[in-house]
């Protein structure tokens, strides 16, 4: 009656185009056009004494320009935020994060591997202190960098004795087919190992650990 | 009752402090104070007909405020650029990159692990086509994520028969104590393996590979 | 697999990537959208106000033949 | 470490990457500093201009006892 | 390795992270919101000034029958 | 799989992380420089307007001896 034991698998582990809003209007054109169309009476009645009405035209022109400029600036930032793209070559280049300084960023999630061995509770506290949580595996596609992680590290998966299920720190249940749980040891906590394997371990046993911060 | 045991798979894979310039001035206070102090004659001479001089005081106030605002905004951006920090809690949060989409970003370097097995030349060409190069190991500190990489992957290290040295694609010589070179087979290319080990391999042998893009 | 043919020289090195970046904002999309909208509205208000302010009014002289200086038009 | 057997050719090297990155977006520090300075100067010009424009001038009434409407002061 | 004493309960879970971000720049939400608001206020001040400047007022002629040109109203 | 030894209590679970983030600036150097320049031009337009508005002009009284109030100069 064979245990299903994971064999090694061959594995593996991208700017908003700014449509340059061609503001092809010369300043003279702009102000002249506005004066001709919008301020004919003002022009004839108040130009020589520089009344407030005449001044209004200038303000209108200036503010109209400022309106276009500000909308353009904010739109650029907004569109970039919306599409998560950089307007530079290559178009597939983008920033990742934000993450704590010197953490690994992959598909807008942040990861850090910690060398020191701690039990599960200490590992969890360590991640918490850095505004993160222990590793949660939620997608083989979005987290395929985990395929090539060596060794065994605490993750945020715990066993719930009342219903026998495995549950993440956030209360969500472990999705089927995400991890191969290998129960060769007794415990209520789990270690992550390469190729999406989870090894059950006594929560009090010291192990290295992986912290994760989800930004998306 | 079978134990679920995973089989291994071979794998390839930042405010500018805004000293809130307490603009705690009601509009009326603001304009009144400026009129009293800055425009006494304007007040006495031109209030009732709302001359341009009176209007000027308002413009001055408004533009003074705008000056403060704009300098603050730009200063914040400038300081951020200067110190490479996030103005949010924690101060150590930052973005990483830019990197090609869906690459791993760590300490502003970009990495990607590729599943498909290619010889060294093909691997190099693949990285080149993505504006990157094969992995270059230049610092155990800046690249400590490489410690936990499973399996064996082509990197940009080649042997120069004329002087017997190991050299990176960019022509730089392999620094001592960076990699432990292990000559498992006869060859002029090297595979990267966990814990900063380099395994000599024939350049024509197909292997998975790691591409890298340095942004710093 | 065959070994590629002879190579006569060492690498001609690529100048690489030269993007620069450090640190990045903290605005959510809804907030950013709100800010853009607010700024747009404020600017339009200004433009609208100056048009209204610049609008010619009927002269009181048209009513009684007298010139009232700094008096509101009564038409 | 032993030296691997001779090879008749070396790999043709990829041009590599050697970019540099600092700042957010794609502004260099000098450029950003220049932009800040330019905006500050423009704003100060505006403030200065309105103060000059708002500066009281000697009334022509003090000269000849007559009120000149919309005439430049002659003192 | 010695095994730490048994634990009687399951882990007390951490509240996680909830930072949000989009775009570039380095302004915190409160600051950026304040700056935008301040800019809006500055713009509105201009609007207010335009309205004040353009607003017709009661003529001082109604007081003493004389026309005071460019004199403050005494009422 | 057998159920590991009983535990006396269950975790107080955290709702996880819900931050969101996307992208870092999207303005190229030429574009951003252009926008800043355009803003500067807008500001200078205002300055120009103020100067024009404050500039003393020749009185129309010098033309025909009459005072034309709020009438365009005819010379």
């Amino acid at each position: 009656m064979g245990w299903i034991r994971g064999r090694r698998s061959r594995h593996s582990w991208e700017m908003s185009e700014f449509h340059n809003y061609n503001l092809d209007l010369k300043k003279s054109d702009f102000s002249t056009r506005w004066q001709k169309q919008r301020c004919p009476v003002v022009k004839s009645k108040c130009r020589e004494n520089a009344s407030p009405f005449f001044f209004c035209c200038f303000i209108a022109v200036a503010m109209g320009i400022r309106f276009i400029i500000m909308v353009t600036i904010w739109s650029a930032v907004f569109l970039n935020s919306l599409f998560n793209q950089e307007v530079q070559i290559p178009l597939t280049e983008s920033y990742c994060g934000p993450c704590p300084k010197n953490w690994i960023c992959y598909k807008n999630n942040c990861y850090q591997f910690f060398d020191e061995s701690k039990n599960w509770y200490e590992s969890q506290a360590s991640c918490m202190s850095q505004n993160a949580s222990l590793l949660k595996v939620y997608s083989k596609e979005d987290q395929d960098l985990l395929k090539l992680v060596k060794s065994y590290h605490w993750m945020g998966l715990v066993h719930i004795p009342t219903n026998g299920s495995w549950q993440w720190e956030d209360g969500s249940i472990l999705s089927p087919n995400l991890l191969t749980i290998i129960e060769m040891q007794k415990g209520d906590c789990a270690l992550y190992a390469s190729s999406f394997k989870g090894y059950i371990e006594n929560c009090s046993t010291p192990n290295t650990y992986i912290c994760m911060q989800r930004t998306v | 009752m079978g134990w679920i045991r995973g089989r291994r798979s071979r794998h390839s894979w930042e405010m500018s402090e805004f000293h809130n310039y307490n603009l705690d001035l009601k509009k009326s206070d603001f304009s009144t104070r400026w009129q009293k102090q800055r425009c006494p004659v304007v007040k006495s001479k031109c209030r009732e007909n709302a001359s341009p001089f009176f209007f000027c005081c308002f413009i001055a106030v408004a533009m003074g405020i705008r000056f403060i605002i704009m300098v603050t905004i730009w200063s914040a951006v400038f300081l951020n650029s200067l110190f490479n920090q996030e103005v949010q809690i924690p101060l150590t949060e930052s973005y990483c990159g830019p990197c090609p989409k869906n690459w791993i970003c760590y300490k502003n370097n970009c990495y990607q692990f590729f599943d498909e097995s290619k010889n060294w030349y093909e691997s190099q060409a693949s990285c080149m086509s993505q504006n990157a190069s094969l992995l270059k190991v230049y610092s155990k500190e800046d690249q400590d994520l490489l410690k936990l990489v499973k399996s064996y992957h082509w990197m940009g290290l080649v042997h120069i028969p004329t002087n017997g040295s190991w050299q990176w694609e960019d022509g730089s010589i392999l620094s001592p104590n960076l990699l432990t070179i292990i000559e498992m087979q006869k060859g002029d290319c090297a595979l990267y393996a966990s814990s900063f080990k380099g395994y000599i391999e024939n350049c024509s042998t197909p292997n998975t590979y790691i591409c890298m893009q340095r942004t710093v | 697999q065959t070994t590629p043919g002879e190579r006569s020289s060492l690498p001609a090195f690529y100048p690489g990537t030269s993007g620069s970046c450090s640190g990045c904002g903290s605005l959510s999309l809804p907030l950013l959208a709100g800010l853009v909208a607010a700024d747009a509205v404020a600017s339009l208000l200004i433009v609208g106000a100056v048009f209204l302010c610049a609008r010619p009014r009927r002269s009181p002289a048209q009513e009684d033949g007298k010139v009232y200086i700094n008096m509101p038009g009564r038409g | 470490q032993t030296t691997p057997g001779e090879r008749s050719s070396l790999p043709a090297f990829y041009p590599g990457t050697s970019g540099s990155c600092s700042g957010c977006g794609s502004l260099s520090l000098p450029l950003l500093a220049g932009l800040v300075a330019a905006d500050a100067v423009a704003s100060l010009l505006i403030v200065g201009a309105v103060f000059l424009c708002a500066r009281p001038r000697r009334s022509p009434a003090q000269e000849d006892g007559k009120v000149y409407i919309n005439m430049p002061g002659r003192g | 390795q010695t095994t730490p004493g048994e634990r009687s309960s399951l882990p007390a879970f951490y509240p996680g992270t909830s930072g949000s971000c989009s775009g570039c720049g380095s302004l915190s939400l409160p600051l950026l919101a304040g700056l935008v608001a301040a800019d809006a206020v500055a713009s509105l001040l201009i609007v207010g000034a335009v309205f004040l400047c353009a607003r017709p007022r009661r003529s001082p002629a109604q007081e003493d029958g004389k026309v005071y040109i460019n004199m403050p109203g005494r009422g | 799989q057998t159920t590991p030894g009983e535990r006396s209590s269950l975790p107080a679970f955290y709702p996880g992380t819900s931050g969101s983030c996307s992208g870092c600036g999207s303005l190229s150097l030429p574009l951003l420089a252009g926008l800043v320049a355009a803003d500067a031009v807008a500001s200078l337009l205002i300055v120009g307007a103020v100067f024009l508005c404050a500039r003393p002009r020749r009185s129309p009284a010098q033309e025909d001896g009459k005072v034309y109030i709020n009438m365009p100069g005819r010379g």
Epitope: R5, R8, K186, Y199 | W3, R10 | - | - | - | -
Partner: antibody, heavy 118, light 108 residues
């Protein structure tokens, strides 16, 4: 510190029986699987048997199936190997070892010698 | 049952690098573990999961696993490294732990 101490070895005639014990300390015995591995004089290591942490699963080498029985008493932090129908080829030093993830043996005892001879 | 083939002996001069191979069909698909056994002593785990070193094991010990051969490498060999070295895998088909025949390392 993890300690594994084997006992119960000795000389026994072919066909005889012997019970080996392994006392464990320094770790949570009830949480880990345990192995018996033997080494004939001048020979290499040969895996003999494995028992899961809760005793629910036991595995044996083909050469000892039906003759040897592995068991454990978690309350006593001890595991056992009951050897029946002993043969001359069973003569070896028997090592007790702690399992890790069902893959490798991370701690070993010093061994106890079992001699099957007439 | 997989057969792990090891040479009975390997000799190396002090300061040199010793390489002890362990052959087996598709061995690269399995985790290979290595044990050192000095005369009269119990075996000690020196490498697990192909190339991981337990705490306390010198950095001179390296493991690799590729193709049909796993290799234990010991750089800058010292006299104290003289011992028998065994490779081991878990046979998931037969639920057995399999050891190689062992290699005696001699430091010349």
């Amino acid at each position: 510190e993890v300690q594994l101490v084997e006992s119960g070895g000795g000389v026994v005639q072919p066909g005889g029986s012997l019970r080996l014990s392994c006392a464990a300390s320094g770790f949570t015995f009830s949480s880990y699987g345990m192995h018996w591995v033997r080494q004939a004089p001048g020979k290499g290591l040969e895996w003999v048997a494995f028992i899961r942490y809760d005793g629910s699963n036991k595995y044996y080498a083909d050469s000892v199936k039906g003759r040897f029985t592995i068991s454990r008493d978690n309350s006593k932090n001890t595991k056992y190997l009951q050897m029946n129908s002993l043969r001359a080829e069973d003569t070896a030093v028997y090592y007790c070892a702690k399992d890790r993830f069902g893959y490798y043996l991370d701690y070993w005892g010093q061994g106890t010698l079992v001699t099957v001879s007439s | 049952q997989p057969v792990l083939t090891q040479p009975s002996s390997v000799s190396v001069a002090p300061g040199e690098t010793a390489r002890i191979p362990c052959g087996g069909d598709d061995i690269e698909t399995k985790s290979v573990h290595w044990y050192q056994q000095k005369p009269g002593q119990a075996p000690v785990l020196v490498i697990y999961d192909d190339d991981d070193r337990p705490s306390g094991i010198p950095e001179r010990f390296f493991g690799s696993n590729s193709g049909n051969t796993a290799t234990l490498s010991i750089s800058r060999v010292e006299a104290g490294d003289e011992a028998d070295y065994y490779c081991q895998v878990w046979d998931d088909n037969n639920d057995e732990w399999v050891f190689g025949g062992g290699t005696q390392l001699t430091v010349l």
